[in-house]
């Protein structure tokens, strides 16, 4: 039981955190413009990964995209990378602990390899977290390294685009999201790991056992790929091990309920 | 047709106050940031007040700042200027005028002439 | 605040011929997210309101002869009329739609010689 909440909960999480990077990439404030010198302007500017736009004090808003591909900082292509990547790996990490869930039966399919589904997926959620909180970091890094190298004359680490003095860029309501979002998906692939020890069967891989045969021993070790993974061709509802295997210790090795399918 | 009309003008002594009122037609009154403008007899022209959209915000003139007050009421298509503590220098024509994009202001009223004098 | 300084104050022309007037602002008006000047250009007839003829520094509002052009970007714009008519006969003002307060110039005089 306690697994089961462990591993729901670990995708509610992850989920919850997935949608938030997916949300923080498409959101135009990764940046906003800094009004401690100017509170009272009548032009507010913001940028984000995709475009910059403009909020005008008569309601209007205007975007431009950054159309050029070539033109745009190293930096920025990075975080943009980084952002996708996690993205990637967290929709793929989804649909894997989809099947992998306790609670939803598919098949035939058994707990170790849904323990394994459990873990591929978690590590799959680590990493999409990851690239997120690095993607977020590495713009907000670039944000404080062009906040403080500010003049009238620079390039920003927007497209390449003049900074006029009196318009410098802090940080925007993206990278908070983005931050959680990656935090909440690391989380729920810690969660979906630990899952996995619990799903897992308590011996993954069967003794050696010694086969008294024809008056001299064999030692053979029998379906340990499969006990671990699931993937093998039994599908009837039969034992898989004969009764009469013994451990080379003599004590009984008895089919575990994983040795079911 | 879009049309702003101003009323409430008048003499006025110093100290005194006064309420302009601006009636907007011809367009959504409620999605337009609106604007005070004045001018001076025989002077230029004079930002004095703007309320944005939502009328959540505010922002004024330093010279009108603690003693005017923009507001608008969206239910009655209607911008206010509320006017205390008025001085001479106070005396103008008041526009009303409607911000667009590049919050520049697309349409004015005629004027409604303020005269502060003792 | 930001200042904005006309040039010149005044200027008498001859009916069909070009005028160009000036403004600089103290600060520069180009919005880095848009890339776009935020200084409007308005003309009063005596006795009338202003009317808008610029925004974005180049931008013509509809209805505005297309004799009258706006120039410039950062601190300095120009409005050009390429050839002067009666009906032109009026104060040109430019203004600061960057920030708050929104500040006017003080406005160019334009008279028929």
């Known amino acids: 039981m306690a697994v089961t909440a462990c591993q729901g909960l670990g995708f509610v999480v992850s989920l919850i955190g997935i949608a938030g990077i997916i949300a923080a990439t498409c959101m135009d404030q990764w940046s906003t413009q800094d009004l401690y010198n100017n509170p009272v302007t009548a032009v507010f500017n913001y940028q984000g990964l995709w475009r910059s736009c403009v909020r005008e004090s008569s309601g209007f808003t205007e975007c431009r995209g950054y159309f050029t591909l070539l033109g745009l900082p190293a930096m920025l292509q990075a975080v943009r990378a980084l952002m996708i990547v996690g993205i990637v790996l967290g929709a793929i990490g989804l649909l894997v602990s989809i099947f992998a869930l306790k609670c939803i039966r598919i098949g035939s399919m058994e707990d170790s390899a849904k323990a394994n589904m459990t873990l591929t997926s978690g590590i799959m959620f680590i990493v999409s977290g990851l690239c997120a909180i690095a993607g977020v970091s590495v713009f907000a890094n670039m944000l404080v390294t062009n906040f403080w190298m500010s003049t009238a004359n620079m390039y920003t680490g927007m497209g390449g685009m003049v900074q006029t003095v009196q318009t410098r860029y802090t940080f925007g309501a993206a990278l908070f999201v983005g931050w959680v979002a990656g935090g909440l998906t690391l989380i729920g692939g810690v969660m979906m790991c630990i899952a996995c020890r619990g799903l897992a069967p308590e011996e993954t891989n069967y003794k050696a056992v010694s086969y008294h045969a024809s008056g001299h021993s064999v030692a053979y070790k029998p379906g340990g790929f499969k006990a671990s993974t699931g993937f093998g061709s039994n599908t009837k509802n039969k034992k898989i091990y004969d009764g009469g295997a013994r451990t080379e210790d003599e004590v009984q090795s008895y089919p575990s309920k994983h040795d079911y399918v | 047709e879009v049309q702003l009309l101003e009323s409430g003008g008048g003499l006025v002594q110093p100290g005194g106050s006064l309420r302009l009122s601006c009636a907007a037609s011809g367009f959504t009154f409620s999605s337009y940031t609106m604007s005070w403008v004045r001018q001076a007899p025989g002077k230029g022209l004079e930002w004095v007040a703007t309320?944005?959209?939502?009328?959540?915000?505010?922002y004024y003139a330093d010279s009108v700042k603690g003693r005017f007050t923009i507001s608008r009421d969206n239910s009655k298509n209607t911008l206010y200027l509320q006017m205390n503590s008025l001085r001479a220098e106070d005396t103008a024509v008041y526009y009303c005028?409607?911000?667009?994009?590049?919050?520049?202001?697309?349409?004015w009223g005629q004027g409604t002439l303020v005269t502060v004098s003792s | 605040d930001i200042v904005m300084t006309q040039s010149p104050d005044s200027l008498a022309v001859s009916l069909g011929e070009r005028v160009t007037m000036n403004c600089k602002s103290s600060q520069s008006l180009l919005s880095s997210g848009n890339q776009k000047n935020y200084l409007s250009w308005y003309q009063q007839k005596p006795g009338q309101p202003p009317k808008l003829l610029f925004y974005w520094a180049s931008t013509r509002e509809s209805g505005v002869p297309d004799r009258f052009s706006g120039s410039g970007s950062g601190t300095d714009f120009t409005l050009t009329i390429s050839s002067v008519q009666a009906e032109d006969v009026a104060v040109y003002y430019c203004q600061n739609d960057y920030s708050y307060p929104f500040t006017f110039g003080q406005g160019t005089k334009l008279e028929i010689k």
């Open positions: 005028t409607r911000l667009v994009k590049g919050s520049a202001m697309d349409y």
């Open positions: 309320i944005i959209i939502g009328g959540s915000y505010t």
